[in-house]
């Protein structure tokens, strides 16, 4: 019902129609050339479009668009429109940037989708030789020309083309950049292998640089190092030592070569060692010093070897910053070799030496023991005078069962006493002294303690209503006095303690009393110390009865009496017999009895009459006296 | 009768392109320039529709709401083949595409298979 034609570009429409809402098929559109130079182009779309876009026409033209529908068969009127595409959009504004010394890029504005494609053309502004001439694609803005001359003035000329139709040319002139060259070379950290090479170039990606480094005198063939065009620098190792070289470089950009820099320079002396020497040697070590150039070694190698190879060679690695060594934990009086290296990255020196010979240890000998007893024993040695600062004594069970006892003792000392060890073991003794800060070999000895002395087998025998006798052996030549202790087993009287000296093996006991149970105990005393003791239980004798008498004497008769003992009895006999023999007659009577009546003698004789007391199966020592019967009357 | 077969799709990230093919056989004695040729196409869910088109002539014409000037219909008679360039893929340009013959009626008469053509964003 309606067609317009909208955005009518430079080669382009855009057209709009309206329908009214049958269900049309399709529509066809007829796009010809007002004055019908070229075929119609015919498009068919579907039904429900209301809206294309047609490009591709050609520029500053006018146009006859057409279009009908066709529904269920049938072809509405056709409508048509009359337009004219615009005139071809100009060029914006043609610029260079990135000038180099053989390339540049070329930028330029255009309207989009102006253009199918650019013509470019470039001549030499000296020759007006056209040296390039390409097209781009209308989508591009932006061109790289290579392969342009150094230090050259070009023109460059822009058109912008469509299918039909040239714009005005666009035109710029540009100088292309000197020639790339390198400069400021330069040495540095010259060293005595090596050398490091500085240069400054223009900024450009350069592909690779070319060293040559060749000795001044062309005695070797020339070194050519390839290195990345992003360095500035190398490091050019694995020269010799005080040697004058030269060193050249270009640079490498695009196949080009620059003009070469070069530059002549000596590298410095070999590092060496020296002056090797030795100081503050004592008994196990000494000091060493040395000379070497600095700033050079990484490390120092230092080897020992004593003179008669007889010690497993030591070697110790020290930082290349050191110019002394302590070297100790060394054998006293000893020779010894000492070798020096320096160690660089590239170089071992000549090895260097010297010789020392550690200071003898004074003399520490001649460990005896002696005073050995049960509880201890005394240890001496000899030593150089004024030599020790102090001595060790370490001494210890020889079953290692107990911890070591150490004393320490001043350098002047030459004895120490040992008390209060145990008894009847072995022990084991180091001595060794201190000088200035080194402990000498300990000089060693072995020893048993005494066995603890003993007193044993205390017997008792004779005893008495008023003691005993003790006696008990005892190991000879120990014990400096015995002690016996006595007290009554009922505790009733206070103890008794008596001491004897040393040679007695027996004592008698008396002022005891009688038909006493006691206790004994005896030990030895020897150096103070008291031995284990032994001990022994006695009952002294039954007291006699005394001051027998005699009364009442007839020719068959007689009676006898005494005083009984203090201590209770059990029984009294009494035994009397003819002094001119016969058999014994015997009479008991009771223990608190004192007196009994002596029957059927003999008149005119003479009788011994005893009376002893009993206990048990115990008896006592008689009372004795006599008598004479009565003759016949 | 005329059979098209289309092919060039395929999955490819947000931003990309993606050049269709469309070659036609069987064209019963007349030559492929007798043809003018269109693209469609069809998201899930959605009907069918039109790209552009391209006449016999060689003229082009699209939907303005699908192309959006990012698409290029061109032909090649000797190949009897018809291309669309689709730049700039967004993630709604996902459908399977298809080209069209109109024919001696004027409408679509011959249709291919269809291509998915797949935009991840």
């Known amino acids: 019902e309606n067609l317009t034609v909208t955005e009518a570009g430079w080669d382009g429409l855009r057209l709009n129609w309206t329908a009214d809402d049958l269900a049309y098929e399709y529509f066809v559109i007829q796009v010809q050339e007002a004055n019908n130079v070229e075929t119609a182009h015919n498009f068919t779309v579907p039904g429900n479009l209301r809206a294309a876009d047609i490009p591709g026409l050609k520029v500053a033209t006018s146009y006859r668009v057409s279009i009908y529908g066709v529904a269920r068969g049938y072809r509405t009127p056709v409508l048509s429109a009359e337009t004219s595409t615009g005139t071809t959009p100009n060029l914006g504004e043609v610029t260079v940037a990135e000038v180099g010394w053989d390339a540049l890029t070329l930028n330029w504005t255009a309207p989009e989708g102006a253009y199918k494609n650019f013509f470019i053309q470039v001549l030499e502004a000296d020759t007006t030789q056209t040296v390039q001439n390409l097209t781009v694609p209308g989508g591009l803005r932006s061109v790289d020309l290579p392969g342009l001359k150094a230090a050259t003035r070009y023109y460059i000329t822009l058109r912008g083309v469509t299918q039909d139709f040239g714009t005005a040319p666009l035109s710029v002139e540009v100088l292309t950049e000197d020639l790339p060259q390198l400069g400021g070379l330069s040495v540095t950290e010259v060293s005595w292998d090596g050398l490091t090479l500085n240069w400054t170039t223009d900024d450009l990606a350069y592909k690779h640089f070319v060293v040559q480094v060749q000795e001044a005198n062309n005695v070797e063939a020339a070194q050519n190092l390839t290195v990345p065009g992003s360095l500035r620098a190398v490091d050019i190792p694995g020269l010799k030592a005080d040697t004058p070289y030269r060193v050249s470089i270009y640079g490498v950009i695009q196949g080009y070569r620059t003009p070469m820099l070069s530059t002549d320079v000596s590298t410095a002396r070999e590092p060496e060692i020296g002056n090797l020497n030795v100081s503050d040697v004592t008994p196990k070590s000494f000091n060493l010093s040395w000379t070497a150039t600095d700033g050079i070694f990484d490390m120092f190698t230092i080897e020992i070897i004593d003179s008669n190879r007889l010690l497993q060679t030591a070697e110790h690695n020290i930082s290349g910053a050191e110019r002394t060594a302590h070297i100790s934990g060394l054998p006293p009086s000893t020779d010894f070799i000492v070798y020096l290296s320096g160690i660089a990255p590239s170089i071992r020196t000549k090895t260097i030496s010297t010789t020392a010979t550690t200071e003898a240890l004074p003399l520490l000998e001649n460990l005896t023991i002696s005073d050995t007893n049960p509880y201890g024993f005394t240890v001496s040695w000899t030593a150089s005078e004024n030599a020790f600062d102090s001595f060790l004594v370490t001494v210890v069970d020889s079953g290692k069962l107990l911890d070591p006892q150490e004393f320490t003792l001043s350098g002047t000392q030459r004895k120490l006493e040992l008390r209060g060890l145990i008894t009847g073991i072995g022990y084991e003794v180091l001595v060794s002294g201190f000088t200035q800060g080194h402990q000498t070999k300990p000089l060693r000895a072995e020893t048993i303690t005494e066995a603890e002395p003993e007193v044993d087998n205390l017997l008792v025998s004779d005893a008495t209503p008023d003691g005993f006798r003790l006696s008990w052996t005892a190991d000879e030549g120990i014990f400096d006095s015995f002690v016996i202790r006595i007290r009554d087993t009922k505790k009733q009287s206070e103890p008794q303690e008596i001491s004897l000296p040393s040679p007695e093996r027996t004592r008698d006991i008396t002022g005891l009393r009688e038909a006493t149970e006691y206790e004994i105990e005896l030990y030895g005393i020897s150096r103070g110390r008291r031995s284990q003791p032994v001990s022994a239980i006695a009952t002294t004798a039954m007291g006699s009865p005394k001051e027998i008498m005699f009364s009442d004497i007839t020719e068959n008769a007689a009676t006898v009496s005494w005083r009984a003992p203090t201590a209770q009895v059990e029984s009294f006999r009494i035994t009397y017999v003819p002094m001119t023999g016969g058999a014994p007659s015997m009479v008991t009577v009771d223990g608190t009895d004192t007196e009994t009546r002596l029957v059927k003698l003999t008149p005119g004789v003479e009788y011994r009459v005893s009376v002893i007391a009993m206990k048990g199966f115990e008896e006592s020592d008689p009372v004795s006296g006599t008598l004479i019967t009565a003759l016949d009357g | 009768d005329v059979q098209l077969q289309e092919s060039g799709g395929g999955l490819v990230q947000a931003g990309g392109s993606l050049r269709l093919s469309c070659v036609a056989s069987?064209?019963?004695?007349?030559?492929?320039?007798?043809?003018?040729l269109g693209w469609f196409r069809q998201a899930p869910g959605k009907e069918r529709e039109f790209v552009g088109a391209?006449?016999?002539?060689?003229?082009?014409?699209y939907n303005p709401d699908s192309s959006k000037g990012r698409f290029t219909i061109s032909r090649d008679n000797a190949k009897n083949t018809v291309y669309l360039q689709m730049n700039m893929l967004k993630a709604e340009d996902t459908a399977v595409y298809y080209c069209?013959?109109?024919?001696?009626?004027?409408?679509?008469?011959?249709w291919g298979q269809g291509t998915q053509v797949t935009v991840s964003s």
């Open positions: 069209a013959v109109n024919g001696l009626g004027l409408n679509y008469d011959y």
């Open positions: 069987g064209t019963s004695g007349l030559t492929f320039r007798s043809f003018g």
């Open positions: 391209i006449s016999m002539t060689g003229g082009t014409i």
